[in-house]
């Protein structure tokens, strides 16, 4: 069940992957929460949508994202986390015909509707992490990742020579 | 060198119990879920359980649920199958098979395999 | 629990002709499908995934097509070394996961 009221469910047929040109080589839903356990949710308000991350109730059912991965071209440098040597990208969507994008000059992560092909800012590159984690990077913006401040979902800027481990950026996604 | 060895095979009285390992070397173990599937002599492939890379998420076949536990040791790149009131259809060569992808979940390909371990159920 | 038919059990066929391999599932399995060969005392080795990709490494022969309940592994044309039996696999949410009865190509 997804916490969106109003808002078609998905079925085990999940999404349409008849998409032309780039297609995902594999999908999954899974909920999606922060290192410090807090969960991601997402609600419809006044014909927009909200992301929020908060603690959520024992008997609430947590939300689930749509997780669609593809291979990308470029090498992964990190060991274990590719295929061949490919990176590994998602697409991240809470409800049908909605994806989160990254807004780089807002330096903020919003779910917008749109028809496939995807824009570039819906891809993520999928980083491995310890701890049963992983964290977002944007394709259109290297050494920008998806983060929480604030109680919400933020785009935050990590130099790799100091915090990628930065508790911030990192993600466990669960069934 | 990317390599998974199963250990544990053999001959096996009705009702008996057997533990199946598999060590895996050469890539980093808890990235990639993990999965046991068997073939019993001249038939098909029949997937049999699977884990996910933290081994928090475990599922099973409708053939061995209740009967076969799944688990994972990752300080010890090790999957192991405990298999308990063992049947004569249980009689199988036992692969442990590797996703293709470092994505921890369980929906994705096999592209490593073992050489398998042959268990026998018979009195 | 997902049943995957394979069909044809058995394709006779002569080296440098095309194989059609076809694998029905009995629900959706979106493009959560893998194709494999194996022969004899092997371990089944990995050709197709994700529906329609192919493995780095393997020929450019080997294609695979279809999402939803139908797919098709093509073999373009047969080489000596492609007699074998061919599997599908879904690994679509939530499991159990299951392969099809598989497709021995034989040379005729």
């Known amino acids: 069940a997804f916490g969106i009221s109003g808002v078609p469910k998905y079925t085990r047929a999940l999404h349409d992957s008849s998409i032309t040109g780039i297609s995902p080589i594999t999908e999954s839903l899974a909920s999606l929460s922060t290192y410090n356990d807090q969960s991601i949710t997402f609600a419809l308000e006044d014909e927009s949508y909200e992301i929020y991350v908060e603690d959520l109730k024992k008997d609430k059912k947590k939300d689930k994202v749509l997780l669609s991965y593809y291979e990308s071209q470029h090498p992964s440098s990190e060991s274990g986390d590719g295929v061949d040597g490919k990176m590994l990208m998602v697409t991240l969507s809470p409800t049908k015909d909605f994806w989160l994008q990254a807004n780089n000059k807002e330096h903020s992560v919003e779910l917008h509707k749109c028809e496939k092909p995807l824009p570039d800012q819906a891809f993520f590159v999928l980083h491995n992490r310890s701890f049963n984690c992983v964290s977002f990077e944007c394709k259109t913006d290297p050494g920008v990742f998806i983060g929480v401040k604030d109680n919400h979902l933020a785009l935050i800027k990590v130099d790799y020579s100091e915090n990628l481990g930065s508790e911030n950026i990192l993600f466990k996604l669960s069934e | 060198e990317v390599q998974l060895v199963e250990t544990g095979g053999g001959l096996i009285q009705p009702g008996g119990s057997l533990r199946l390992s598999c060590a895996a070397s050469?890539?980093?173990?808890?990235?990639?879920?993990m999965s046991w599937v068997r073939q019993a002599p001249g038939k098909g492939l029949e997937w049999v359980s699977a884990i996910s890379g933290s081994g928090g998420s475990t599922y099973y076949a409708d053939s061995v649920k209740g009967r076969f536990t799944i688990s994972r040791d990752n300080s010890k790149n090790t999957l192991y199958l405990q298999m308990n009131s063992l049947r004569a259809e249980d009689t199988a060569v036992y692969y442990c098979?590797?996703?293709?992808?470092?994505?921890?979940?369980?929906?994705?390909?096999?592209?490593?395999w073992g050489q398998g371990t042959l268990v026998t159920v018979s009195s | 629990e997902i049943v995957l038919t394979q069909s044809p059990g058995t394709l006779s066929l002569s080296p440098g002709e095309r194989a059609t391999l076809s694998c029905r599932a009995s629900q959706s399995v979106g493009i959560n499908l893998s194709w494999y060969q194996q022969k004899p005392g092997q371990a089944p080795r990995l050709l197709i995934y994700?529906?329609?990709h192919r493995l780095t490494g393997i020929p450019d022969r080997f294609s695979g097509s279809g999402s939803g309940t139908d797919f098709t592994l093509t073999i373009s044309r047969l080489e000596p070394e492609d007699f074998a039996v061919y599997y599908c696999?879904?690994?679509?949410?939530?499991?159990?996961?299951?392969f099809g009865g598989g497709t021995k190509v034989e040379i005729k």
């Open positions: 098979a590797r996703t293709l992808h470092g994505i921890r979940a369980a929906y994705d390909a096999f592209i490593i």
């Open positions: 696999h879904q690994y679509s949410q939530p499991p159990p996961f299951t």
């Open positions: 050469g890539f980093t173990f808890s990235f990639y879920a």
């Open positions: 994700g529906a329609s």
